[in-house]
């Protein structure tokens, strides 16, 4: 297993609709054809997997149908979007990149993007 540098923004504020996007960029030492991207959430010392996708270079990222993540790739950059976020989902979102094929296997883990989420103000009830 060889180490690889992964860069991501330090902090992002999610939109009022609970959507946060950020770029995860990795310094690919070779010509990888198969890449796996995993988003981990660290909160209160607990680390949980948010979503993961494996993709072939030049193709779209495919997350599971029920995933809260979507993404696109361009060269050594992955543009990740996490949706359906609420205030309780505020935390450090860490990008993990694995170059699966061809060998050698490379692993890189970013420092994390702190995502802040604000629950929207409830709309006042209106009578019609």
């Amino acid at each position: 297993c060889k180490a690889m540098h992964v860069a991501q923004p330090a902090v992002v504020l999610a939109s009022s609709r609970g959507i946060a996007s950020f770029v995860c960029e990795y310094a690919s030492p070779g010509k990888a054809t198969e890449v796996r991207v995993t988003v981990l959430r660290q909160a209160d010392s607990q680390v949980t997997e948010v979503c993961a996708a494996t993709y072939m270079m030049g193709n779209e990222l495919t997350f599971l149908d029920d995933s809260i993540c979507t993404g696109t790739s361009s060269g050594n950059q992955v543009n990740l979007t996490i949706q359906g976020l609420r205030a309780m989902d505020t935390g450090l979102y860490i990008c993990k990149v694995e170059l699966m094929y061809p060998p050698p296997y490379y692993l890189g883990i970013g420092n994390g993007t702190q995502i802040y989420v604000i629950d929207p103000e409830p709309c006042p009830d209106s009578d019609f």
Epitope: P9, A10, V11, V12, L13, A14, S15, S16, S21, F22, A43, D44, S45, A87, T90, L92, N111, G112, Q114, Y116, I118
Partner: antibody, heavy 116, light 108 residues
Framework: QVQLVQSGAEVKKPGASVKVSCKAS????????INWVRQAPGQGLEWMGW????????NYAQKFQGRVTMTTDTSTSTAYMELRNLRSDDTAVYYC?????????WGQGTLVTVSS | EIVMTQSPATLSLSPGERATLSCRAS???????LSWYQQKPGQAPRLLIY???TRATGIPARFSGSGSGTDFTLTISSLQPEDFAVYYC?????????FGPGTKVDIK
């Protein structure tokens, strides 16, 4: 090295607006947020809100909602804070401060005096 | 909103003495999101401690932070003349971010 350089002192009349700038250097501006914090004479630190330079999204303290606007110009790595309808109790030193995983670097502060 | 309280409001000590400053949050704060700042008259605040216990770059070892949940402490093991200042704790665990009212450490 990381630096946040703020605009100079301002004297304003009640009801006017003020726009304070904060020019960042020494780091990738869009990877961080900018907080605005003020300090009235002899008082403590009061958080006003912050802007995510990555996407321009903002979050303001309830007290300032509707009266403050925070913006960034990523081409010049500069953040702005505009406060409208100034009152005498808005007299304070206004600080910008960088937010990553925590607030680390601060500007030197801008004194805004509101007086008739 | 998480309300931060600090005690005592003023601490009068002599150089060489140990200073213990307390910060309490109205609800639990993950220690990763608790910072301490020092402010001297006419100057901007300076980051001392982040993540409740990690010293910022260039901060002397006499400054240490501890605590978890709702109770946090800043300790200055042996006060130096340049340490007499106001100290603030701050949380960025939840929006809105909030500061404590400060503890003034002055010369006895």
């Amino acid at each position: 090295q990381v630096q946040l350089v703020q605009s100079g002192a301002e004297v304003k009349k009640p009801g006017a607006s003020v726009k304070v700038s904060c020019k960042a250097s020494g780091y990738t501006f869009t990877n961080y947020g900018i907080n605005w914090v003020r300090q009235a004479p002899g008082q403590g630190l009061e958080w006003m809100g912050w802007i995510s330079a990555y996407n321009g999204n903002t979050n303001y303290a309830q007290k300032f909602q509707g009266r403050v606007t925070m913006t960034t110009d990523t081409s010049t790595s500069t953040a702005y804070m505009e406060l409208r309808n100034l009152r005498s109790d808005d007299t304070a030193v206004y600080y910008c401060a960088r937010l990553g995983h925590y607030i680390d670097y601060w500007g030197q502060g801008t004194l805004v005096t509101v007086s008739s | 909103e998480i309300v931060m309280t600090q005690s005592p409001a003023t601490l009068s000590l002599s150089p060489g003495e140990r200073a213990t400053l307390s910060c309490r949050a109205s609800q639990s704060v993950s220690s990763s999101y608790l910072s301490w700042y020092q402010q001297k008259p006419g100057q901007a605040p300076r980051l001392l401690i982040y993540g409740a216990s990690t010293r910022a770059t260039g901060i002397p070892a006499r400054f240490s932070g501890s605590g978890s949940g709702t109770d946090f402490t800043l300790t200055i093991s042996s006060l130096q003349p340049e340490d007499f200042a106001v100290y603030y704790c701050q949380q960025d665990y939840n929006l809105p971010f909030t500061f404590g009212p400060g503890t003034k450490v002055d010369i006895k």
